[in-house]
């Protein structure tokens, strides 16, 4: 169908509750172009009808509530005038929450659900909350180690709840819970968060963190569009510079003349004591002589790779 | 590093009632659902049970519902396990062993507590 | 509940011998819930492989985990004298929690 393929990380979602997901893909949805959502490779599209449990509201693809059959791998497809991309995002929808059981929970942990606070200096914990237009978010409850949070350390502001002198004590597993209204009707959202005390200056000192990727390997097929992000948390007044690199090469300069490899555009979101960094690279087309090389992200003096390898083949096909 | 200690060896006899005790310690975080597992001699594991410290929630094995209660004192970070109405089938080695949150494993456990019913 | 049986139930292996056991599912289990203990006698089970492929903290790299929905394996490339002990696998993603019923391996 000339769509050309690219393969998103995994979203580990909570069953119950609403969850959304925004199909963009910043150098294509710029433009005039038209988004299509799929389920699981199917030819009939995602209802567009608002009253449908699962429903594609403009870009998005609204789940109102995500239920655990809904695991698998959704496509968004996006059509412009002159090209069309299928971006492939795989959804795990995990069962219960912690506070209920530990069984079924949630099996491993993304990023938003870590977040750090800084020993002794006034902090903030976010509650990620991404939805469409169409859905009204009401205040935010917070709840520490299943218990509501209460005392004047503690304040709701909007999407954030700011700690107080922080402490030792102050660490543990949060939640933030919301009601979200959407066409008359109520559904709540808790997402949980794990929290960690650092009693280092600003953000881990000067030493930038790479938070993804973790020097692993990543099954691509052979000719398709990959897209990794290189997710790094840093000082605010930092002077380090993010890049990807290949043979201790800029991937740019690398892939100078056919482009196929490109390095894209820094983009940072400002947090009250770091900065959270995401630059990413993209293969337009993996090819054999890709497999098996370090594609090193550098951020200051702190480097983590990844490497491309083939997926197993998978015999039960033949 | 997490250490579970737990209470000594225990010879009852049948119909009587036992409460067993794990204590956390070490770089335990806040959050955690302490586990009660059972092992028979020459037996496989079995799972009793879980309860949450925090707010003391549990969850059962239908198996054990009325033989098995499990009860936490938050301020000295120890859970306990009462069994009650003690048959010779009750005879074993019970562990404790925590959970935490986004890693749903058995990670540490404790060195087991024996108990043995006989008349 | 959903039933884990581990076979075979006995084994022994010599010296730099690969063993594999597997461990089966009465039912489907996401493999992020399936995970194996190592136990000897008179001591606690340890934590061995978690998630179905991802060692536990000090466990040697002979050691290796796979499988998805209701077949698992725990396979060791090649045996030593204190990989002698039984392993049982557990799920943790329906409750009951259940476990398997172990697998004694022992030294030739």
């Known amino acids: 169908d000339g769509c050309k393929d690219i393969f998103m990380k995994n979203e580990i979602l909570s069953a119950s509750q609403p969850f959304a997901f925004n199909c963009t893909f910043p150098p294509i949805t710029s433009g005039e172009v038209s988004v299509t959502w799929y389920k699981n490779s199917s030819k009939i599209p995602v209802s567009k009808i608002i009253q449908s449990r699962i429903h594609q509201d403009e870009t998005w693809i609204l789940f109102l509530p995500m239920e655990w059959g809904d695991s698998g791998v959704y496509q968004c497809v996006i059509k412009g005038r002159d090209s069309c991309h299928r971006i492939h995002v795989n959804l795990t929808v995990f069962e219960k929450h912690w506070c209920d059981t530990s069984i079924g929970g949630l099996p491993n942990l993304s990023d938003e659900y870590k977040q750090i606070l800084h020993l002794g200096k006034d902090d903030s914990l976010t509650c990620h909350l991404h939805f469409p237009k169409s859905c009204v978010l009401g205040p935010i409850k917070w709840y520490k180690d299943c218990n509501e949070i209460k005392g004047e350390r503690f304040t709701v502001l909007e999407t954030r709840l700011l700690v107080s002198n922080v402490s030792a004590e102050d660490r543990g597993n949060y939640a933030c819970q919301a009601i979200l209204t959407h066409s008359g009707k109520q559904y709540e959202v808790l997402n949980g968060i794990t929290v960690s005390i650092t009693e280092r200056a600003g953000y881990g000192g000067s030493v930038p963190k790479i938070i993804y990727p973790k020097n692993h390997s990543i099954e691509v097929q052979l000719g398709t569009t990959l897209i990794v992000d290189c997710n790094v948390t840093d000082t605010k007044d930092n002077t380090n510079l993010r890049c990807w690199r290949v043979n201790n090469t800029l991937v740019d300069d690398y892939y100078d003349e056919s482009k196929r490899i490109r390095e894209g555009v820094e983009t940072h979101v400002s947090f009250r004591e770091h900065n959270l960094y995401t630059v990413n690279i993209t293969f337009l087309e993996v090819k054999m002589e890709d497999y098996g090389l370090p594609f090193m992200c550098h951020a200051g003096v702190s480097t983590a790779y990844i490497i491309l390898q083939l997926p197993a083949p998978d015999f039960r096909a033949y | 590093q997490v250490q579970l200690q737990q209470s000594g060896t225990e010879l009852l006899k049948p119909g009587a009632s036992v409460k067993l005790s794990c204590k956390a310690s070490?770089?335990?975080?806040?959050?955690?659902?302490m586990h009660w597992v059972k092992q028979r001699p020459g037996q496989g594991l079995e799972w009793i049970g879980e309860?949450?410290?925090?707010?003391?929630?549990?969850n059962y094995n239908e198996n054990f519902k009325g033989k098995a209660m499990l009860t936490v004192d938050k301020s000295s970070s120890t859970a306990y396990m009462q069994l009650s109405s003690l048959a010779s089938e009750d005879s074993a080695v019970y562990y404790c062993?925590?959970?935490?949150?986004?890693?749903?494993?058995?990670?540490?456990w404790g060195q087991g507590t024996l108990v043995t019913v006989s008349a | 509940q959903i039933v884990l049986t581990q076979s075979p139930a006995i084994m022994s292996a010599s010296l730099g011998e690969r063993v594999t056991m597997t461990c089966t599912a009465s039912?489907?289990?996401?493999?992020?819930?399936l995970h194996w203990y190592q136990k000897k006698p008179g001591s606690s089970p340890k934590l061995w492989v978690y998630?179905?492929?991802n060692l536990a903290s000090g466990v040697p790299v002979r050691f290796s985990g796979s499988g998805s929905g209701t077949s698992y394996s725990l396979t060791i490339s090649s045996m030593e004298a204190e990989d002698a002990a039984t392993y049982y696998c557990?799920?943790?993603?329906?409750?009951?929690?259940?476990f398997g019923s172990g697998t004694k391996l022992e030294m030739k």
């Open positions: 039912s489907s289990v996401s493999s992020s819930y």
């Open positions: 309860i949450l410290p925090s707010t003391g929630r549990t």
């Open positions: 070490g770089n335990t975080v806040t959050s955690y659902w």
């Open positions: 062993t925590i959970v935490y949150f986004g890693n749903p494993w058995f990670a540490y």
């Open positions: 557990h799920q943790h993603h329906r409750s009951p929690v259940t």
């Open positions: 998630s179905t492929s």
